[in-house]
Each structure stands twice: as structure tokens, then as C-alpha cells.
Interface confidence: medium
Amino acid sequence: SAPGEDEECGRVRDFVAKLANNTHQHIFNDLSGSVSLSWVGDSTGVILVLTTFQVPIFMITIGQSKLYRSEDYGKNFKDITDLINNTFIRSDFGIAIGPENSGKVVLTADVSGSHGSRIFRSSDFAKNFVQQELPFVPLMQIMYSPQNSDYLLALSNKNELWVSKNFGGKWEKLYDTVCLAKWGSDNTIFFTANHNGSCSNDRGMLELWRTSDLGKSFKTIGSKIYSFGLGGRFLFASVMTGKGTLRAIHVSTDQGDTWSMAQLPPVGHEQFYSILAANDDMVFMHVDEPGDSGFGTIFTSDDRGIVYSKSLERHLYTTTGGETDFTNVTSLRGVYITSILAEDKSVQSMITFDQGGRWTHLRKPENSKCDATARDPEKCSLHIHAAYSIATGLNVPMLPLSEPNAVGIVIAHGSVGDAISVMRPDVYISDDGGYSWTKALEGPHHYTILDSGGIIVAVEQNAHQGVNQIKFSTDEGQCWQTYNFTKDPIFFTGLASEPGARSMNISIWGYRSSLFHQYWISYTIDFKDILERNCEEKDYTIWLAHSTDPEDYEDGCILGYKEQFLRLRKSSVCQNGRDYVVTKQPSICLCSLEDFLCDFGYYRPENDSKCVEQPELKGHDLEFCLYGREEHLTTNGYRKIPGDKCQGGVNPVREVKDLKKKCTSNFLSPEKQNSKSNGSAGGSGGLNDIFEAQKIEWHE
């Protein structure tokens, strides 16, 4: 294992005294069964805590909630329940925080048995609230427009779509029988509606609508819709093909004015599509296999979301809206980790460093031995525990963690063998974006990153005993110090730190319980005195990302460019600070065949970088539907990978000629320019987009 508190570790001097002076306890005198935290704004120090207590009596639920506010990162809290007239706030979607640093907060009250509902609105970071009656009962959390926090969207429990243009002061009904609604860019609203009056039946008979003026005018942009999703600049719709129950994906990059055919296999009613990740360059799309296989195939798109390359087969994704381990490693460009379901039904972790171009097993940590799952005790891999392991009940308290401003750092639970093990997992850390790993902590832990990677904090998961210790590392997990934050252990429920990993504060949440009394308690520890000085130039060192062969002139080239970062030296104990900006120097690489994906009608044979014509299309004119026009493609089989910045070197030629013919299909409404395409379903009737609110919830 990694060095612990031994002579080799550079111990931080006098850390116990320094931390003791900066440990703040807060006791919440309330018996509530659950607590949820929300950060209001960025670098404001404002936290809202909602505690809720619910008791079901016959057909109704009686509940009470309390609201607390901190403006010093959780060191002190004030009970502000009276600001909302002691109203019961729903714990499931009660707190909606406005985008960016708007300071806006909407609390949705639970008014049982009423035809309407009530919200409390704040525009000043929850200092004051205004009560507002609603003419409907919300079905889900109120949605802010990403572009204008005064514009709110809500779906009612009667499937009505409502909009407010003045931060919830006045509401207008936009449409009835709306099944799914989402904000797009530029305050555009997309929604599906069913004129038959039901969202549960007739999936596949929905219409997709768009309004760009908050409901003054509407445009139908698709029919026979099963579902839709937004990812990056792409709008996806899954559409019934007219061939029985098959549906297929259509993609638009102009807000639904024109649609193009996504070269993806159609799926049946028991299958699903899921957007695993999307940005403005490309999309990772999961296509489920027929039957209850529990796996499917990951495809990566071109820059138009139309041509797809097979990226990873046997990708684990249990059922519609089920579990997948797909993880974007945000601390290093192009890196993703996920799991496959092998032929022998074992679950194995895979990693890609080039945005899905190639996948490999994770390298075995040098300080670890292969476990009992390994056929060869010398040869095995690291396997990462993520959502699937948590869903199956393994003792995995946290998903893998990475932060864009903590360059190269990845923290995850894992096991070392031929496949994921059901044994007690350990915590592993990579400091180079997943190329190499070391065992950092024995057994399951909660963990978080502070000060852009300058400090990593962990608390051991111990379900049966109380917790009174926190571990921290100032050298990216090589060495750990232990600090007792309290004499009397607490029943630990979770760690909380401000999103963005820039804070120096960590809150340890839990509760104390006796025969007669139970209460929530938090300990907030400020590490500012551990990192006493600000980092200087000498504290940083140059690091070439994705470097695997320093001898190679193209070393570090991923997606056509390489990046050198200034990284904090492991031996430096100093503050990056809240204003820390990642310093990187990019350098463009020469193009090679690796910088191109195979074009429509071409594929890459196994272990070959050349694209060859699909046998069934050899000698045929390649014509396909693009933006509602028939196109003729003249290509030697290559198209540049989305986001690839290479210049010079290999330069395959391609040309697309407009055949000046309209191509239409009956998949989308016939009055529009439309086209063949392929579609999607996910957990709640949308493509599984993976955008979650910054909210932490704990229950006893």
C-alpha cells in the first residue's frame, strides 16, 4: 500500500493544533430524518440546509422541514425557517438554485390536498424570501433558463407546461399534456406533447415542439417522437420508424429546423439509447443490445452527430434508466472510464485516453497484488467501482472523483484482478489522468478534493461504528495524516465541500443518537493554516499530459495536440488559492490516420488504423440524407475526429456534393424538410442526459 504515517512521509508540522483551531462544530436541534445541502452561488460561502421529517398517515404524508443558512462555508448556521413561514419544503425537489452566481433560490412547498402549490423565492442568496402561490402543483423541480435566471419552466402534476418570465412572480400556461420539457440554448424551450391526453401510453406518438419566444409562438419540429434529448449543440429525437416498434435517432444542429440521419442501429421497444456524454464537438451514444442482455455498444459521433464509429462493445448498462459506470475523467482531456460485461459475465473496467478511439484495461497499480479473480497472479488490471457496484449493494460509498482544476488527479474505489471483485474495495489514486494508479487507502472511504488538488481529504466508511477521524494528504495521496476532529464519534453520513474543489473547507456531517435524543451535527474544518503560504512559481513543475514515450516526437499528442501543464509539486505544501487558474501550453501535432474517424460507408478492421470500405457498399454511390437534402459523398474513407486540432502530416481528401434533391421520410412531420434518423429513450422518458444539480442528500 501507499506510505501511511511513517518516516518516509513528509509530515505537516503542528497540524493537530492548526486544525483544532479551525474546526467548527454546529449542532442542529432537530429530529428530522433526512438532510440536504445546496450551495448558493460560487465562492459566496452560502449554504442552505434543508432538514425534513415525513410521516405517512393513511393516504397523505404529514411532514415538517427546517431551513438553515450559512454564509461562512458551513462553520456557522442560522435557522431561517421563519423566513418561509415554517412551511414544509419538499425534500425531493424542494431547493432549486439559480444558474451561475445569480443568487436566486426557489423553494417548492408541499401543500397537501391543494389544487395549487406555493413557492418561496429569493434573489439575494437566501437572505430574504417572497412567498408566491402557484396555480398548479409541480411534478418536478422548477427549471431555470441557463441564459436568464428570471425565466422559469415548470411541469405540473397534470402534465401542463408553465412558464414565468419574472422569476416566478407570474405564471402562464404554455401547453397541455406535455410529457417532457427542456430548456435549450437562447431561452428556447423544447417539449413533447400528446394530443391523446396521456404520457404513459402512446410513447412513440408524441409531437416535438419548440418555442423560441417563451410561448408567443410554437413550431412542431417532429412527430412520431418517442423521446428527445439535448447534448452539447445537438438535439436528438428518437422516432418511430414505421417498421413495427422500431425507433431510430434523428439529430439536428439547428434547433430542429432540419434533421439528419444518425448512422446508428434502430432499436425495439425493449431497448434504449442513452447519451453518455456530449459536448459541442461530439457525442458518446450507448445503443442497447436486444433482449435483457444488460449491455450494449458505445458509438462516438462525428462533428455533426450523424456518422458514428463503434467505440466499445459489450458496454455495461443494465436496463432503461439503469446503471452504467461510464465516467468522464474531467481532470484530463479525452479520458473516460467505464465497465464492460465480459463473455464470462464478469464485469471489467476499461479506459480510453483518446475520447473513445481505443479502450484498454487499467494498468495494475505497482503497489498492489492481483486478487483471487486473477488467473495469472502476476498479470491483472485495476477495476473501478462506480454506479453499478453501488447499485448491487457493494460497500462503495462514492463514485470516482476528478476535478478539471485538479489536473491529472482521479480518485476511485477499486479492486485488482481479472474483473471487479465483490470483496471490500480499496481507494486508488491516479495523478496522471488514469495512466498509472497507486493504492492510497485501505478499505472504503468518502473522499473529496480541496484547493484544486492541494489537499485530498478522506473519511473511512464505517457503518457499524462512529467516526471521529479525518485523513488528509497534501501530496496527491502518497502520504496521509490523521486528525481526530471530535472526542465523541458521530454516526457519519457524508462529506460536503463546495463544488469546484477550490475551497479549503470540508464539512463532516452525521448525527448523534441516544435512547431519548437524536440530532444532526456538522464539523467544518478549514485547512487554511495547513497550507500557510501562497504557492509561488518554484512550487510548480512542468508536466506533459498523456506522455507515454518521451522519446517520441509526437509524445503526448491526443486529438491532434499536446498540452504541458504547470502542476503543483508533491513536496510543496502551499495554497493554490481560490483564484487558481490551470496553466497550460498547447502545441499542435502533425496529423496521422489516428486523427481521423472512418467516414460513412467505411470501417476500421481490428488493430488497423486504415479505414476500408464496407463490403456491402463497395462500388455503390454513397448517398445519404443531410439537413433534408440528398448528398453524394466522395471520400477516401476518413473524416477528422471532432475536436482534433492536428495540422499537416497525413491529409485524406473528402468532398460532399449536394445532389439538389430533397429527401424526406415519414419519421418526422411531412410538412417539413425531414430525414431518416435514429432515436432514444432513457430513464424518465428522455435520453439519459447526465446533468445533475449540485445537491447533497443524506438519510439515516
Partner: antibody, heavy 121, light 109 residues
Framework: EVQLLESGGGLVQPGGSLRLSCAAS????????MNWVRQAPGKGLEWVSA????????YYADSVKGRFTISRDNSKNTLYLQMSSLRAEDTAVYYC??????????????WGQGTTVTVSS | EIVLTQSPGTLSLSPGERATLSCRAS???????LAWYQQKPGQAPRLLIY???SRATGIPDRFSGSGSGTDFTLTISRLEPEDFAVYYC??????????FGQGTKLEIK
Amino acid sequence: EVQLLESGGGLVQPGGSLRLSCAASGFTFSSYAMNWVRQAPGKGLEWVSAISGSGGSTYYADSVKGRFTISRDNSKNTLYLQMSSLRAEDTAVYYCTRGRGIGYYNGMDVWGQGTTVTVSS
Amino acid sequence: EIVLTQSPGTLSLSPGERATLSCRASQSVSSSYLAWYQQKPGQAPRLLIYGASSRATGIPDRFSGSGSGTDFTLTISRLEPEDFAVYYCQQYGSSPMYTFGQGTKLEIK
């Protein structure tokens, strides 16, 4: 001070051999790729050969492939160019240059003063 | 093989004037791998610009590089007497690893 100093040039007959050396100082020699570049009298610059920091990878211009061998001794901070089967068109001033550090190509930022090789009967 | 063509072959200007030297590649070149060198008679070349636009250490700011793809330019904003020399552009490619342009001679008018 970062410095490169070539030696070993001279007059040699066609078909003959010569070994050039380049002594490096003032920088971590093993961290840099190194090159040989030549300049025929009154002509422009022509790249001849390159070697990676550890010596594990070598590269040659087509005009010298099979006749010239580049090597390095990192313990002595020295670069070599073994030239055999020399031809009249190999007559030039040969410069030793520092190439790329790990990770980046930032141009040939350090040049020696050059050593003259004359191939004539 | 990528061929670099420099123009003009000779440029006659007076001190204080602005000099613009061109380097055109036969196919697209990565701007990260385009460099400019200055060579005075009897001396070794000296690196001026790397990465198409980054000045090497100690190079005065009157020297600047620009361009991408196939067209690159070296500009000397205000010629000093010591700037009259031969200028070479160079690219790093795959085969051969490096190629130089034929050079532009900058002479005093």
C-alpha cells in the same frame, strides 16, 4: 552557459570515413534530442540526422541513410556522427544542434560553431 | 516530402524599414513545428522564432512570426543594421524529419 562544440572534421577521400564529435555543456544533455545539420559551400541548410534523448530512436535524411550513423554517450555528454562511404556532395560545414526537450519541439535552439568536412581526391 | 519555398530570394531594404519574408509549404504544416533562423556570414544559424509565432530567448520584439497551414511570414518591424543576413524557415515533419527553405537574403539597399 549552454554550449556545443564540434570536432573531427577534415579532408577525406571519396569512399572514406570520418567520425564527428559534439561536446555538450551547460544543460541536461540526456533530456534533449540532438541533430546534425550541414551546409554545403554557398548553399542552404540541410538536416542530416537526429537522435532522441536516450539514444533509443535515430532518424536520417534519405541522402545519408545507410552511410551515416548517429549515436550519443550521455555519460560523456557527447554526440557522434560516424560517416562512411563519403561522397563529394557530402562536403559541407556540419553543425551539431540541440533539438527538442521532452514534450515539445521548440526549434533548434542551440547550435555549435560547425566543423568542416571536405571530400575530395 | 514537404517542400518549403521562401520568397523573395533577395530582399533589398534600408535600416528603419519593415521587412516581410514569406515561407510557403507544399502541403499543410503544423504551426507548432515551424521555425525561423537567422544566419550571418561565417556564423552558425540562430533560432529566432519557433511554433510559428513564439520568439526564442533573447530575440528582440521587432521580430515576429505569423501564419498557419501553408503560408507563414517573418516580419521585422524596423530594420537594424545587424538584421541584414540570410533567413531560413524550417519545418518538423515526418519524413524527412526536418526540411529548410532555400533561404531569403536580406541585404542593405
